[in-house]
Amino acid sequence: ARNGDHCPLGPGRCCRLHTVRASLEDLGWADWVLSPREVQVTMCIGACPSQFRAANMHAQIKTSLHRLKPDTVPAPCCVPASYNPMVLIQKTDTGVSLQTYDDLLAKDCHCI
Amino acid sequence: ARNGDHCPLGPGRCCRLHTVRASLEDLGWADWVLSPREVQVTMCIGACPSQFRAANMHAQIKTSLHRLKPDTVPAPCCVPASYNPMVLIQKTDTGVSLQTYDDLLAKDCHCI
């Protein structure tokens, strides 16, 4: 169940895809990645108010229990629902290789 | 990549499975669920310090960028890695039915 996409906190405040520019140094990859030198990292950032983009039944339960016990149960969290692959040119024992990482760039977000 | 399971914040402080007891009223289910009357909800709660139970490359990136830009990029979040099914006896238009929910109870946790 993918619930409401209307953010009650105001435009852009709720869970959505953001792009953060990062260098290989920022990522701690400079010693093993040759390319790309800079990555447009897409990630899921934002609040998860009641039933906003609830990923599943568990997220709905979490919302209900957070409302009841906010000190014990955290609100649902904005995380990737799916990913885009990314290809890196990386150093290997024998030289250099292309490697696809399927879980590197967020493609879509939900609350869980 | 499922990284270190050692919690640097002290025992039980990092992302792990917790059990929260909840009634049908707590969950907002009283009008459509007959049984169970009380649910032992297993959910993922706790901090996600650097590389602790990192779910994938995305989580590792998030850790690195959170360290660099804590106001922009949140730390990884403790969420279910897998679920246990749960069977509810629920009301239907025609009476009562058994229904299995595959995404209700967290079974295992990771940081993402």
Epitope: L34, N84, P85, T94, G95, S97, L98, T100 | -
Partner: antibody
Amino acid sequence: EVQLLESGGGLVQPGGSLRLSCAVSGFSLSSYDMTWVRQAPGKGLEWIGIISGSGNTYYASWAKGRFTISRDNSKNTVYLQMNSLRAEDTAVYFCARGILVYADYGDHNLWGQGTLVTVSS
Amino acid sequence: DIVMTQSPATLSVSPGERATLSCQASEDIYTNLAWFQQKPGQPPRLLIYAASTLASGIPARFSGSGSGTEFTLTISSLQSEDFAVYFCLGVYTYISAEGAFGQGTKVEIK
């Protein structure tokens, strides 16, 4: 000695299929990326695609769907399967070790001598 | 799709002179670029990789420079064996990976 030897070329009719082989010796295929390149008579070089050491494949956009790169590590051989061949696919087909824009350790320039594919009726 | 554009198509140079060949990428390819020399009936020979690193066994008169989208191959003093066709190859990676050669520059004797 480290070597690459292409085979499987020849005359094929338009619409036909052909599988080229690149037999390698002197190194383990699973440790290296392998690239296929072609060159039409009197023309420039054309990048076809790569199979990585981990088995992922990457293709030029024009090659996607018609050309497939695979490998058999036990036979130390890389393959280029070509389908729905057209006259403009007539070329010498080369295999080469590595991704070419960066050097592998050791031999920096390992290419086969090429195999000629002629598509004609 | 990545497109590599070489210029000029033909370069007429006298032996002993300097030759400068250009290659432009349609995408930012960082230093994912190599230069090859090819003579008739032979496979290409790697001269420069990573945009500026001289391949083993290649004379020091060959040098490469550039990054991003603009690249140059320089032959400081042309020898008779340097008259050949030169190709650049770029590889672009992001959500996938794709390579492309430039159309080639023929270096001929003036």
